[in-house]
């Protein structure tokens, strides 16, 4: 059965979260995609989204979040730079497909940001613009304001299954392994 996993990333303030969400490219390549935070007891909140239609490998920067949608590979890359302790939380990628509800992607990311500074090489570069050399880009359309209330629950509904396996049972598995990511600032 396909499982909706939750990966835990432990990082320090100032570091960069660099993750990816995959999707069925034949179905969702040009669909608008978004990065959301899920706070306990609240509806998921959209923090950034790609353009509509989504452009291939065209970086969209919203504050400290950079999204790059690699249509031809079926991957959405998400970077959160210069992390702050208050960025800690549970995140997910979704695909907007109005009028249907957003389609949740694999995997959910449990981000834990702690104070302190890592001595990993390159960790002293904290300027987003210097690091990424990406001109800030605003999306052509605002991110949709609605979010399905169904994505708030801990056990996701079957509708969030990979489209290629619609009958798969989805289990939210708590992954205990912690991914400690080297600094890329």
């Amino acid at each position: 059965a396909t499982k909706l996993t939750e990966e835990k990333y432990e990082l320090k303030e100032g570091q960069t979260l660099d993750v990816k969400c995959d999707y069925t490219l034949e179905k969702f390549a040009s669909s608008q995609k978004a990065w959301q935070i899920i706070r306990d007891g609240e509806m998921p909140k959209t923090l950034a989204c790609t353009e509509r239609p989504s452009k291939n490998s065209h970086p969209v920067q919203v504050g400290r979040i950079i999204l790059e949608d690699y249509h031809d590979h079926g991957l959405l890359r998400v970077r959160m730079v210069n992390l702050q302790v208050e960025d800690s939380g549970l995140y997910q990628c979704v695909i907007y497909q109005p009028p249907k509800e957003p389609h949740m992607l694999f995997d959910r990311i449990r981000l834990v940001v702690t104070k302190g500074f890592s001595g990993t090489p390159g960790s002293n570069e904290n300027s987003t613009q210097n690091v990424y050399k990406i001109p800030p880009t605003t999306t052509k359309a605002l991110c949709p304001l609605y979010t399905s209330p169904r994505t708030v629950t801990q056990a996701p509904p079957k509708s969030t299954a990979d489209v290629s396996t619609p009958d798969s049972e989805i289990n939210l598995t708590n992954v205990t392994d912690i991914i400690r990511v080297p600094v890329f600032n």
């Epitope: 990816k20 999707y23 690699y70 590979h73 079926g74 890359r77 090489p121 992954v175 991914i179 990511v181």
Partner: antibody, heavy 122, light 107 residues
Framework: QVQLVQSGAEVKKPGASVKVSCKAS????????INWVRQATGQGLEWMGW????????GSVQKFRGRVTMTRDTSIHIAYMELSSLRSEDTAVYYC???????????????WGRGTLVTVSS | DIQMTQSPSSLSASVGDRVTITCQAS??????LNWYQQKPGKAPKLLIY???NLETGVPSRFSGSGSGTDFTFTISSLQPEDFATYYC?????????FGQGTRLEIK
């Protein structure tokens, strides 16, 4: 033992298809990407694409698009790479390689199969 | 696509020598660079990831450095088992590409 075991050598005629298998053991198959890399005799390494064994989603580089299909069977921890419309220049050793966590951008290949030689000849 | 250019393409050295291989990216890849060793008839082996991090179990005579477009791979004291072909590989964006390889031969 953590390893990737690939299927044996194949000889195919131009226009045919080949399906290479890669069996994972010793780790959680669905938590790491599987990548496919090929190497023609005496040549360098060429990345073909990736697959997330959990979701089943995959992507490939432009030159293989429409010819390559990456699938998996999670019940037996096997990843497959099928290449169709074979031509002589597809003669190469095909490697499967474990990538990073399915959620991580870090694409490094820390575990490799021994390779499968595919010969395309009329 | 990002081009990765390794130099030299081949070099001869003796046991005990210090050997340096360079890899140049056609654009800024920050530290998104890995190094592999490949012996004839064998699969590649990851040595260095993220430009400078030594993979578990790899001897400390291997090291990597660099950031942006210029990277260096060093073997501090060449051992007989180090004669092989070495490749760099970037993952700053997609597609992932490898350098053309550097063949290290016995002098």
């Amino acid at each position: 033992q953590v390893q990737l075991v690939q299927s044996g050598a194949e000889v195919k005629k131009p226009g045919a298809s080949v399906k290479v298998s890669c069996k994972a053991s010793g780790y959680t198959f669905t938590r790491y990407d599987i990548n496919w890399v090929r190497q023609a005799t005496g040549q360098g390494l060429e990345w073909m694409g990736w697959m997330n064994p959990n979701s089943g989603n995959s992507g490939s580089v432009q030159k293989f698009r429409g010819r390559v299909t990456m699938t998996r069977d999670t019940s037996i921890h096997i990843a497959y790479m099928e290449l169709s419309s074979l031509r002589s220049e597809d003669t190469a050793v095909y490697y499967c390689a474990r990538g990073g966590y399915t959620s991580s951008w870090r694409h490094y290949f820390d575990l490799w199969g021994r390779g499968t030689l595919v010969t395309v000849s009329s | 696509d990002i081009q990765m250019t390794q130099s030299p393409s081949s070099l001869s050295a003796s046991v005990g020598d210090r050997v340096t291989i360079t890899c140049q990216a056609s654009q800024d890849i920050r530290k998104h660079l890995n190094w592999y060793q490949q012996k004839p008839g064998k699969a590649p082996k990851l040595l260095i990831y993220d430009a400078a991090n030594l993979e578990t179990g790899v001897p400390s005579r291997f090291s990597g450095s660099g950031s942006g477009t210029d990277f260096t791979f060093t073997i501090s004291s060449l051992q007989p088992e180090d004669f092989a072909t070495y490749y760099c590989q970037h993952y700053a964006n997609l597609p992932i590409t490898f350098g053309q390889g550097t063949r290290l031969e016995i002098k």
